[in-house]
């Protein structure tokens, strides 16, 4: 069917439109365009005859139309009067007529709108404001935006005059916003510049800050007043009804008890003509003394002494408070408070009880804190540690050992070699060592305040030959798919390379194998039964090499799903039933049987002589591994038939 499509349907003035013809018949005599919904010679725009290839303008031709060979009509430089219907009349080659009608609408390009207002400074809760979007334009839609959002739903917002006017009834301060209007028609949309609504409001009831009303003698009084207001409020202060000053802040230094009284802030808005006041009552108290802490033992010994801390001075009807490490007191059986909370006792002090400790005296206004006190807890020495941890050294190197023991006061150190005192230093240094320097090296740490001593002995071997290494393990019986195992090659030796072999081969590449600690430690993550192999570590330096004895990893696994053999499930009556159950497991699992759910025997083999049809049923084998804590089972159905009834049945064992 012949149809006309207008592209575009909505056309802007001055632009062009194409009346595009669809399904134009093939063989034509000619065609003609008419303005309107019917063929009317007086309103013919242009016609075209195929045979003569001649386009003939009609009475409605304006000079802006172009007709195309496919019968489509282009109208340029569109004017408002072009709006409406257009009819194409087609005469086919057999002189049969066909016609189709299309239409388009013409709209003007809109100018940028602006907003006019009937009230530039409305007063809150009193005035209304009417915004009007200019200019008034035919066939235009008017939209409004508040802070770039579409209009909120509110009974105080009313659109009128075809949405061209936006009225805000009883304006509030929250209406202070950016307002924009937008004009739209099908061919254009333009938005106005924003208009900021300036709502006059307030003053609200002023707020006086800070809120506290109790002060200590000698403090500075600094009160600030604020009231929401547009334009900003003018402030005045009154003390006990007497005018003081016209400022937003009131400052009185070094107040006394005489400054107690009622303080009034008055806020005034010159535009709205409104005044609001707020009163606060200030009380000034005399200053209490600053507390301090006394101790019955300034140098307590760890795990021996108790310490009593007392908050001074003693004041009647006073609440005493304590803090440790700037926190309130923790709950601990070693912390005890006296009945009046003035004395804090630490029973059997530890090195962690150093503090700081603070006490406080609470009065009507505030809490006065003491200066912090730190306890000097005497402790140690702990067992000294000798570093580095190497025990094997090559001749010719320097031996440098350092000793450290936790202690307060710091420990005094002594070194002994094979029981002979060497020197009273924290570090021992011997240059260019030989095999003769092998021996027992003892570090002794002494705390002069507590009188305690502690020693640590280390065997040092000086040898060109490396010792035979050994493998230590953090887990001798790891469980498959669960545990990790860390092998460490001992001893730790200086300038030594560590190597590993599995089943006589170098380490395979695997994301589950990880070397660390200078290759001295080999970690197997998520062990599997296949990891149950012989592991050997080796040490080597520039003059010697040695290998450990193999360590075989005993991986606990299973039990896997058991298998019942033989696989036969059909038997003849009178045969012997001999079922064997097997499950891969380390250690070997425990076996048990159930027939039709009834427990039988705890053996790997189930034997029943001369079975009958009564032995039909489900035979379940259960396996459990006590080491892995895992269980498994399998069920097999057995059918026993009377003798000679069914060929192909097993005769049994």
């Amino acid at each position: 069917k012949l149809t006309i499509e207008s592209t575009p349907f909505n056309v802007a003035e001055g632009k062009e439109v194409l009346l595009l013809v669809h399904n134009l018949p093939q063989h034509l005599f000619g065609y003609s365009w008419y303005k309107g919904e019917r063929v009317d010679g007086n309103r013919q725009i242009i016609g075209y005859v195929i045979g003569t290839q001649q386009a003939t303008p009609g009475p409605a031709y304006s000079g802006r139309e172009i007709i195309y060979p496919n019968a489509s009509l282009l109208i340029q430089n569109i004017i408002q009067n072009d709006t409406g219907f257009y009819t194409l009349h087609v005469i086919k080659s057999d002189l049969v007529n066909e016609e189709a009608t299309g239409q388009f609408r013409v709209y003007p390009e809109l100018p940028k709108p602006s907003i006019s207002s009937n009230n530039s400074k409305p007063v809150e809760d009193k005035d209304a404001v009417a915004f009007t979007c200019e200019p008034e334009t035919q066939d235009a839609t008017y939209l409004w935006w508040v802070n770039n959002q579409s209009l909120p739903v509110s009974p105080r917002l009313q659109l009128s005059n075809g949405n061209r006017t936006l009225t805000l009834f009883n304006v509030t301060r929250n209406d202070t916003a950016s307002y924009k209007c937008e004009t739209q028609n099908p061919v254009s949309a333009r938005r106005s510049d924003s208009v900021i609504l300036n709502v006059l409001y307030g003053p609200d009831a002023p707020t006086i800050s800070p809120l506290n009303t109790s002060y200590r003698s000698g403090e500075n009084l600094n009160l600030s007043c604020h009231a929401a207001s547009n334009p900003p409020a003018q402030y005045s202060w009154f003390v006990n009804g007497t005018f003081q000053q016209s400022t937003q802040e009131l400052f009185i230094p070094n107040i006394t008890v005489n400054n107690s009284g009622s303080y009034t802030c008055q806020a005034h808005n010159s535009d709205t003509g409104l005044n609001r006041t707020t009163v606060t009552t200030i009380t000034v108290y005399a200053e209490p003394p600053k507390p301090f802490i006394t101790s019955n033992n300034s140098n307590p010994v760890e795990d021996e002494d108790a310490v009593a801390l007392t908050c001074e001075p003693e004041i009647q009807n006073t609440t005493y408070l304590w803090w440790v490490n700037n926190q309130s007191l923790p709950v601990s059986p070693r912390l005890q408070l006296s009945n009046d909370n003035r004395t804090l006792t630490l029973l059997s002090v530890t090195r962690n009880d150093v503090g700081p400790y603070e006490c406080g005296i609470q009065n009507e206004l505030s809490v006065d804190h003491s200066d912090p006190v730190i306890l000097n807890v005497l402790y140690g020495p702990d067992d000294p540690t000798i570093s580095p941890s190497y025990t094997y050294y090559r001749p010719g190197v320097n031996l440098s050992l350092s000793c450290h023991a936790a202690s307060n006061p710091p420990a005094q150190y002594s070194w002994l070699i094979d029981g002979n005192i060497q020197q009273h230093t924290q570090e021992l240094f011997i240059s260019n060592i030989t095999e003769k320097n092998s021996g027992l090296y003892t570090c002794q740490a002494n705390n002069s305040a507590s009188g305690h001593s502690r020693t640590t002995v280390k065997t040092i071997t000086v040898s060109a030959e490396l010792p035979k290494p050994s493998i230590s393990s953090n887990n001798s019986k790891p469980v498959e798919d669960k545990d990790a195992v860390a092998f460490t090659c001992e001893p730790e030796a200086q300038n030594t390379t560590y190597l590993w072999w599995v089943n006589g081969q170098s380490l395979p590449v695997s994301p589950r194998l990880q070397l660390s600690n200078g290759n001295r430690t080999l970690t197997l993550f998520n062990v599997t039964r296949n990891d149950a192999r012989a592991y050997v570590c080796g040490i080597q330096n520039s003059v010697s090499a040695n290998r450990s004895d193999p360590v075989t990893l005993d991986v606990l696994y299973g039990p896997d799903t058991p298998i019942i053999s033989p696989p036969d499930s059909s038997y003849l009556s009178g045969a012997n039933l001999n079922l064997s159950c097997h499950s891969a497991s380390n250690p070997s699992p425990q076996y048990s049987w159930r027939i039709n759910g009834i427990p039988q025997q705890h053996t790997q083999v189930l034997f029943i002589a001369k079975i009958t049809p009564n032995n039909n049923g489900t035979y379940a084998c259960f396996v459990s591994n006590l080491a892995t804590g895992r269980n498994n089972s399998i069920v097999k159905s057995i059918t026993v038939s009377a003798s000679g009834t069914s060929p192909g049945l097993s005769a049994g064992a």
Epitope: V39, G41, G47, Q54, I91, D94
Partner: antibody, heavy 121, light 106 residues
């Protein structure tokens, strides 16, 4: 000046045949659509047939379809109407007419003076 | 086929009269209607095409109007040479004529 001159009319027995000719001059015949209209004695006008400028487009009234054939020879500027199986009701004055080459609903702007065909035994 | 009905079939009028002849189609034919004038013994002559377009050389006292199914031929002021038979023709398919209206001198 446009001229259309019909010929070939006459008396013919029912069931007989007749061929009418129309000699055209004064316009570009080869690009013009042509047609035949007849008028029985004392009766109104009846459109009979039309033909396109290139002979490929032809139309007929139901009353003559299958019996009459319209054709043209553009080299001779001549229009033809071959009438077979003639009946008594085919008796009429046959007019040759011209369709103007304008993009308006079809209309006949020039007519010949007509030729009389009488079908009678 | 589309039937064309003219009314009246005959009409008597005097010189100077305004005369109206109507033509009705059995279904809508848009503006596809032509009017012809025929005098006795003569070939028809085209007056109006496309319902309202006046053929070149035809006096302006002849006018046509209508669309869809109802059409009118109007002679605003009858002249002696206007007494003849008038036919309407639909330009659809096939191009059928009305039965004619005979305009006689009163």
């Amino acid at each position: 000046e446009v001229q259309l001159l019909e010929s070939g009319g006459g008396l013919v027995q029912p069931g007989g045949s007749l061929r009418l000719s129309c000699a055209a001059s004064g316009f570009t015949f080869s690009s013009s659509y042509m047609g035949w209209v007849r008028q029985a004695p004392g009766k109104g006008l009846e459109w009979v047939s039309s033909i396109g400028s290139g002979s490929y487009s032809t139309s007929y009234a139901d009353s003559v379809k299958g019996r009459f054939t319209i054709s043209r020879d553009n080299s001779k500027n001549t229009l033809y109407l071959q009438m077979n199986s003639l009946r008594a009701e085919d008796t009429a004055v046959y007019y040759c007419a011209h369709y103007p080459s304008v993009p308006f609903p079809p209309h006949l702007d020039y007519w010949g003076q007509g030729t009389l065909v009488t079908v009678s035994s | 086929d589309i039937q064309m009905t003219q009314s009246p079939s005959s009409l008597s009028a005097s010189v100077g009269d305004r005369v109206t002849i109507t033509c009705r189609a059995s279904q809508s034919i848009s503006s596809y209607l032509n009017w012809y004038q025929q005098k006795p013994g003569k070939a028809p002559k085209l007056l109006i095409y496309a319902a309202s377009s006046l053929q070149s050389g035809v006096p302006s006292r002849f006018s046509g109007s209508g669309s869809g199914t109802d059409f009118t031929l109007t002679i605003s002021s009858l002249q002696p040479e206007d007494f003849a038979t008038y036919y309407c023709q639909q330009a659809g398919n096939p191009h059928t004529f009305g039965q004619g209206t005979k305009l006689e001198i009163k």
